[in-house]
Amino acid sequence: QSGPLPKPSLQALPSSLVPLEKPVTLRCQGPPGVDLYRLEKLSSSRYQDQAVLFIPAMKRSLAGRYRCSYQNGSLWSLPSDQLELVATGVFAKPSLSAQPGPAVSSGGDVTLQCQTRYGFDQFALYKEGDPAPYKNPERWYRASFPIITVTAAHSGTYRCYSFSSRDPYLWSAPSDPLELVVTG
């Protein structure tokens, strides 16, 4: 075969947002018949030559960026896309509110505001049922999340997290849920 082997996939189960002391499994998936997997934590000297890493209790220093690759014969694959494993519950939960209120008419405007007692500069908004918040970079890094021209699709349960840019994979506990109701 010419060229590198195709990259494997790397996922965190049940989620890449992991509360402290809760379990998570990292799984590297390549094609059938792989000779060797290598799963590594970036910016660290640690790696393992296995496809699955079971973390029975999430710890702060296990948060960060992971990637994996595999070997067939003497050929190594391209590395997987990076997986960002986030530890949640490291800090107290922020509060989430809606301005002017959590009930909004279709076509109206609403702003979701995340507030923390820490001097954190980073926030993530998460709508139940959506992908994890870091899959939506446009939603990062602001305490205020304006939603212009609300539609029925914006209805749902929202939570926010706060964190520091100094330790971007150590997040607060989630805020209490905010139910956004779109009427009309």
Partner: antibody, heavy 116, light 102 residues
């Protein structure tokens, strides 16, 4: 070569304060959690405190909570342990160590003696 | 030395086994350290059996509450104290085993 060097130990009276420092070299300091671990002849090895790589998160063993503060200066590759309201049971050799869970590099240690 | 530590005597070339039992299931969240007199501890193994660039005569096994550090052929330079440490629930060290030559 990874090196950790502690300083600031000494003999101090109960209730007084002491600040330990640890200077790191040979690795990218800002990539790693750092910790303090102590060793007393009567109590063996005890984890004291840890701090995250960026310094936003820090935590301590219950017996030193509210008295000890761990901090770091990544620009100087330095780790600190501010020890206030010292007690005789804090007497030990204090080690600076790299990591939060297991500790893959250690300094040589600095002696802290709390006695009247 | 810690008054709760144990003493083990063995001869050069012996296969030496050190045991560590945690008070609960700690999965594989266990490390082993070697500490020579007047020196800092040195990490030998983490995650129960992952090596750190140490001599191949050192190996680790176990999972749950019961773990073992094995030295396949004892050398004079292995005279030291050995500690296990669990980091599943908090972070605690065992009292240690002082290994000496017969």
């Amino acid at each position: 070569e990874v090196k950790l060097q502690e300083s600031g130990g000494g003999l101090v009276q109960p209730g007084r304060s002491l600040k330990l420092s640890c200077t790191a070299s040979g690795f990218t300091f800002s990539d790693y959690f750092m910790s303090w671990v102590r060793q007393a002849p009567t109590r063996g090895l005890e984890w004291v405190a840890s701090i995250s790589s960026g310094g936003a998160s820090a935590y301590w063993r219950d017996s030193v909570k509210g008295r000890f503060t761990i901090s770091r200066d990544n620009a100087k590759s330095a780790l600190y342990l501010q020890m206030d309201s010292l007690r005789s049971e804090d007497t030990a050799t204090y080690f600076c160590a790299r990591g939060e869970l297991d500790f893959d590099y250690w300094g040589q240690g600095v002696m802290v003696a709390v006695s009247s | 030395a810690d008054p709760n530590s144990t003493l083990l005597s063995a001869s050069v070339g012996d296969r030496v086994t050190l045991n560590c039992t945690a008070s609960q299931n700690v999965y594989k969240n266990l490390a082993w350290y070697q500490q020579k007199l007047g020196e800092a501890p040195r990490l030998l193994l983490y995650s129960a059996n992952s090596q750190t660039g140490i001599p191949s005569r050192f190996s680790g096994s176990g999972s749950g509450p019961d773990f073992t550090l094995t030295i396949s052929s004892l050398q004079p330079e292995d005279v030291a104290s050995y500690f296990c440490q669990q980091y599943y629930s908090g972070n605690t060290f065992g009292a240690g085993t002082k290994l000496e030559l017969k």
